[in-house]
């Protein structure tokens, strides 16, 4: 995590910050969708367990062509140890659930925020 | 509008149990944390511990550690604590209480924002 | 634990005058995260407790400007601007900090 934020900010930025920062896109998006997120897209659900910063990734990886979401998928991207590519299935996928993109973004922030709350960066 | 409606008042007899519940409504309990807190009769206010019901995660205070068991029901937007081992200390009047989470706040108060009425809980032989 | 001590234990104030609660915690209550939960609570007679001040100096709504919070590290102050007779009650510093939470022991407002 010591090399997040080379978009936002020159140097290393500390593990509480990138994720600060993450809380504040995904609260960018939802505050700011008047139109149906991503255009109604549907992407897989996950658990919100460890490894998630992958699993959200991967989910999200898969769809394309929406602006709205390409700087969390950037910032996500910090989080996970492996390169995520479109197409990739992880364990931690809720199978046979697909959720909009809205919804996914509302209860992965709602996680993120307890997370922040309780000290676990990483 | 948000309310926290608790169980009514127990009388129980030393080293039993009691189960207070605490039905919430007004807003999801999976966006929040869910707080116990009690105050004995003249006292001081006490947090006793903490559940998050999104997944069941708890954070108890050490004294308590082993005697409250602190559970939460989605489906029926409940909070519960339950207290065994009962002693005449342990008569106190016990409050639920939520910290709330929302989509549009980066870094939401967390604070005790809402509490319950209270439980009046005497153990007496 | 951390222990939050409050001064005085009791406070009479006359309506109109100003009042000042002090409180102050065995170590330092800034979370990993940067912030620090500190927040106040007002107890009325016979009332559930109910939330004024959290992270030290932000207003919950509705609460009037004349209560403010203040402080930083160990060291921290509730302050009403003009005492009103419907301030009566115990107040009580919490802090969210570090596990085990806890509450000061609270200082009682009453009126002279």
């Known amino acids: 995590l010591t090399c997040l934020g080379g978009f936002a900010s020159p140097g290393p930025v500390p593990p509480s910050t990138a994720l600060r920062e993450l809380i504040e896109e995904l609260v960018n998006i939802t505050q700011n969708q008047k139109a149906p997120l991503c255009n109604g897209s549907m992407v897989w659900s996950i658990n919100l367990t460890a490894g998630m910063y992958c699993a959200a990734l991967e989910s999200l990886i898969n769809v394309s062509g929406c602006s709205a979401i390409e700087k969390t998928q950037r910032m996500l991207s910090g989080f996970c140890p492996h390169k995520v590519s479109a197409g990739q299935f992880s364990s931690l996928h809720v199978r046979d659930t697909k959720i909009e993109v809205a919804q996914f973004v509302k209860d992965l922030l709602l996680h993120l925020k307890k997370l922040f709350r309780e000290g676990q960066f990483n | 509008q948000v309310q926290l409606v608790q169980s009514g008042a127990e009388v129980k007899k030393p080293g039993s149990s009691v189960k207070v519940s605490c039905k919430a409504s007004g807003f999801y309990i999976k966006d929040t944390y869910m707080h116990w807190v009690r105050q004995a009769p003249g006292q001081g206010l006490e947090w006793m511990g903490t559940i998050d019901p999104a997944n069941g995660n708890t954070k108890y205070v050490p004294k308590f550690q082993g005697r409250v068991t602190i559970t939460a029901d989605e489906s029926t937007s409940t909070a519960y604590m339950e207290l065994s081992s009962l002693r005449s200390e342990d008569t106190a009047v016990y409050y639920c209480a939520r910290s709330i989470y929302d989509d549009y706040h980066y870094d939401d108060y967390y604070a005790m924002d809402y509490w319950g009425q209270g439980t009046l809980v005497t153990v007496s032989s | 634990d951390i222990v939050m001590t409050q001064s005085p234990l009791s406070l009479p104030v006359t309506p109109g005058e100003p009042a000042s609660i002090s409180c102050r915690s065995s170590?330092?209550?800034?979370?990993?995260?940067?912030?620090?939960?500190l927040e106040w609570y007002l107890q009325k007679p016979g009332q559930s407790p109910r939330l004024l001040i959290y992270?030290?100096?932000d207003r919950f709504s509705g609460v009037p400007d004349r209560f403010s919070g203040s402080g930083s590290g160990t060291d921290f102050t509730l302050k009403i601007s003009r005492v009103e007779a419907d301030d009566v009650g115990i107040y009580y510093c919490?802090?969210?900090?570090?596990?085990?939470?806890?509450f000061g022991q609270g200082t009682k407002l009453e009126i002279k």
């Open positions: 170590q330092n209550i800034v979370h990993i995260n940067g912030n620090t939960y």
């Open positions: 992270k030290i100096s």
């Open positions: 919490f802090q969210g900090s570090h596990v085990p939470w806890t």
